[in-house]
């Protein structure tokens, strides 16, 4: 068209994909009557009539815009709905009277890309490659126009650098007219890049201005040769028997070499390979003192077959051996003395304590306990505790039972038992002594003996209550080679209404236990002593 070059620049209208573009015809009244206007789209310099206005009434022309155009603002504005990227072109309005004039509008279309998707090269990158290797790929889908990509490493933008950094970007047009951008970052990496954080950023424009979207940060597997191998022990600090100890090999290479852990045989001084779990960790559970020794790790690079050896590491599993007490089963006469000696070995300095088993009372701090002028109450348990003060929880104990020779000692001398005539009584009688006594009863019935511990016996008698029994009562006699002793059980008739807690009625029968709930006289509670005989 002659003189078109002198035409003013078109008015710019910016709109996002999917929204409505308002195309306002900027002809003044002098330039044309807006009640008689033709609208054209210009594509590749070809004009196509798309809409006509006559006497203020609009009419779409058949074609791609037929369904999306409408007249607004008393005919001065053409509304284009559902804008697509293909709508980015020049639209013009042409007035017919008084003379033909036109007004041009440049429609610009925008669409923000989706969040960038970054994929790291799963195969990783060797540090000694000759040229840049693929680090990661960034994809920005469905943007318009094509967004710009910037790659970052540790928060700093990466620039193209010959033989070091190369960014290769390409785009595809979707059927929608939107662009998908793919950018590949290639780089030569060094060992220090093993922890580097890479991400990509998409820069794009919208009618509201410039915007950007960032991908997540990724690290790329970087492969570099091992230079050093070492051992790590968990937990750190002092180890003790019973702990779970893990010995693992570590290397500064990636991938790590094939590890083997060996322990020096103290006899042959040869390194002997230990069996590790699937993760190459040597687990000592529970750790024992035999696990102490010199460990080392060998790392074998299966590609180069180069083998590296760690510095040896001394492992010390602290222990306390079984505690030995001598004499182990002391027997003493009343009035005599006894020296108990406690021994144990340890990898650390030991502290010894003697406790009375029944009360927990500390009797002595040290390995030797001296007991003088022994009374029979001194019989029973004494516990030696060997502990390592510098390692909490590392201790061993040994119980020794002191047996004091003596005739039987009854749990009670006499006791009243409430009974009913014709009930079956369950009587019990307890005695202690060394040697362990046997118990007999002065009445016929079913008796059974239970060894409570080696110095204590409990006899149970089932007997029917008869008038004769009520008159005589029941005696139990405990005897050993050193003498005998008797307990008397007095039987008292009780009315049904005055049953005491000592007797209970079950299906017409009553059982009454004559042994006390607490042995007022006895120190044989909770004893663990060797036992003498019961006659077989």
């Amino acid at each position: 068209v002659p003189g078109e070059a002198e035409q003013p620049a078109p008015e710019l209208v910016e709109v996002e994909v999917g929204s409505t573009a308002l195309l306002k015809c900027g002809l003044s009244q002098s330039q044309g009557n807006l009640s008689h206007v033709d609208w054209f789209s210009v594509h590749k310099e070809k004009r196509t009539l798309i809409f006509r206005v006559r006497q203020g009434q609009g009419q779409s022309e058949p074609g791609e815009y037929e369904q999306r155009l409408s007249l607004q603002d008393r005919g001065a504005t053409l509304a284009l709905t559902q804008v697509t990227p293909q709508d980015e072109r020049i639209f013009l309005c042409q007035g017919k009277r008084p003379r033909s004039q036109e007004y041009r509008i440049q429609l610009r279309v925008y669409k923000a890309p989706e969040e960038p998707n970054i994929q790291v090269n799963p195969l990783g990158i060797p540090v000694n490659s000759k040229e840049p290797e693929e680090v990661a790929t960034c994809v920005g889908r469905n943007g318009y126009p094509i967004p710009q990509v910037i790659w970052y490493k540790n928060g700093r933008p990466l620039k193209e650098e010959k033989n070091r950094v190369h960014i290769q970007s390409s785009q595809t047009v979707e059927s929608s007219g939107l662009y998908t951008l793919q950018s590949i970052l290639k780089a030569q990496l060094v060992k220090e890049d093993k922890d580097a954080q890479f991400y990509c950023e998409l820069n794009y424009r919208l009618p509201s201005g410039n915007h950007m979207k960032e991908s997540r940060e990724v690290t790329v597997p970087v492969f570099y040769p091992t230079e050093k191998v070492w051992l790590e022990v968990e937990p750190v600090g002092m180890l003790k028997e019973g702990d779970r100890v893990e010995i693992r090999c570590l290397a500064d290479g990636n991938p790590p070499p094939h590890f083997s852990i060996s322990k020096q045989n103290p006899s042959t001084r040869e390194a002997e390979e230990e069996t590790t779990n699937d993760n190459g960790v040597l687990v000592l559970e529970p750790a024992r003192k035999e696990h102490s020794g010199r460990y080392e790790c060998q790392g074998l690079d299966l590609d180069t077959m180069i083998s590296l050896l760690s510095e040896p590491q001394e492992l010390l599993v602290n222990y306390v051996s079984d505690v030995r007490v001598s004499p182990a089963a002391p027997e003493r006469q009343e009035g005599s003395s006894l020296t108990l000696t406690c021994e144990a070995e340890s990898s650390q300095d030991l502290e010894f304590q003697w406790l009375r088993e029944e009360t927990g009372q500390v009797l002595e701090r040290g390995p030797v306990l001296q007991l003088h002028d022994l009374k029979r109450e001194a019989g029973g348990g004494y516990r030696c505790v060997a502990s390592v003060p510098s390692i909490p929880g590392l201790n061993r104990t040994q119980l020794v039972n002191v047996a004091i020779f003596g005739p039987p000692w009854m749990a009670f001398k006499e006791r009243k038992v409430w009974v009913k005539e014709n009930m079956v009584l369950n009587l019990s009688c307890e005695a202690s002594g060394h040697p362990r006594p046997t118990i007999s009863w002065n009445v016929n019935g079913t008796a059974s003996e239970q060894d409570q511990d080696p110095q204590r016996v409990l006899s149970t008698l089932n007997v029917l209550v008869t008038p004769e029994l009520l008159e005589t009562g029941v005696e139990c006699t405990a005897s050993n080679d050193l003498g005998k002793n008797t307990s008397i059980l007095f039987l008292e008739l009780v009315n049904l209404t005055t049953l005491t807690p000592d007797s209970n009625t079950t299906t017409g029968l009553s059982t009454s236990t004559a042994s006390p709930h607490t042995r007022a006289n006895s120190t044989s509670t909770e004893r663990k002593l060797p036992e003498p005989e019961s006659r077989g």
Epitope: P435, D481, K528, G536
Partner: antibody, heavy 118, light 111 residues
Framework: QVQLVESGGGVVQPGRSLRLSCAAS????????IHWVKQAPGKGLEWVAR????????YYNEKFKGRFTISRDNSKNTLYLQMNSLRAEDTAVYYC???????????WGAGTMVTVSS | DIQMTQSPSSLSASVGDRVTITCRAS??????????MHWYQQKPGKAPKLLIY???NLESGVPARFSGSGSGTDFTLTISSLQPEDFATYYC?????????FGQGTKLEIK
Amino acid sequence: QVQLVESGGGVVQPGRSLRLSCAASGFTFSNYWIHWVKQAPGKGLEWVARIYPGTDITYYNEKFKGRFTISRDNSKNTLYLQMNSLRAEDTAVYYCARSGGYWYFDVWGAGTMVTVSS
Amino acid sequence: DIQMTQSPSSLSASVGDRVTITCRASKSVSISGYSYMHWYQQKPGKAPKLLIYLASNLESGVPARFSGSGSGTDFTLTISSLQPEDFATYYCQHSRELPYTFGQGTKLEIK
């Protein structure tokens, strides 16, 4: 030192009697149990009897009850085993041995040999 | 009576060997963690000598290579490293009840 010494063994005819002695020294005789243990030639050990010298209480292996009697003389710190109606199967070494109240034998005499033969 | 069965009846071993002798009682000889089982060594023409008392306690003066273990009915005497002077006959004995009985003996001979 603690010692037990047996004596009284020898050759005896079946049906006759023999008294074995066991002299104790080096410990308080009345505070321990003294036992007799039999060992027939090439055979194992067999417990015969025990006495507590402090109270004179005795126990026997049923196998020897009635023919054998254990006794003591505290003034001499000596233990005895009276063996009556001897039989060929009584031929053995007889040991005396000491125990406490747990009945393990911590001190033994050297033994005395009894041979019953016609 | 409680029967005591020792095994083996005899065994041949060499100096330095680890040797185990077992003894089984016909009923339990243990009470409250204490076991009335004892072990003796006897050499030809000599009296028996106490080695282990109450199943696991080493008698004073007995070398530490001797050890005992077990409870209930099953017991073991172990010699960790045989010495020339250990070739002898070994007996177990219970004292759980009367009558006390011994095992039949295990004769340990030089291979």
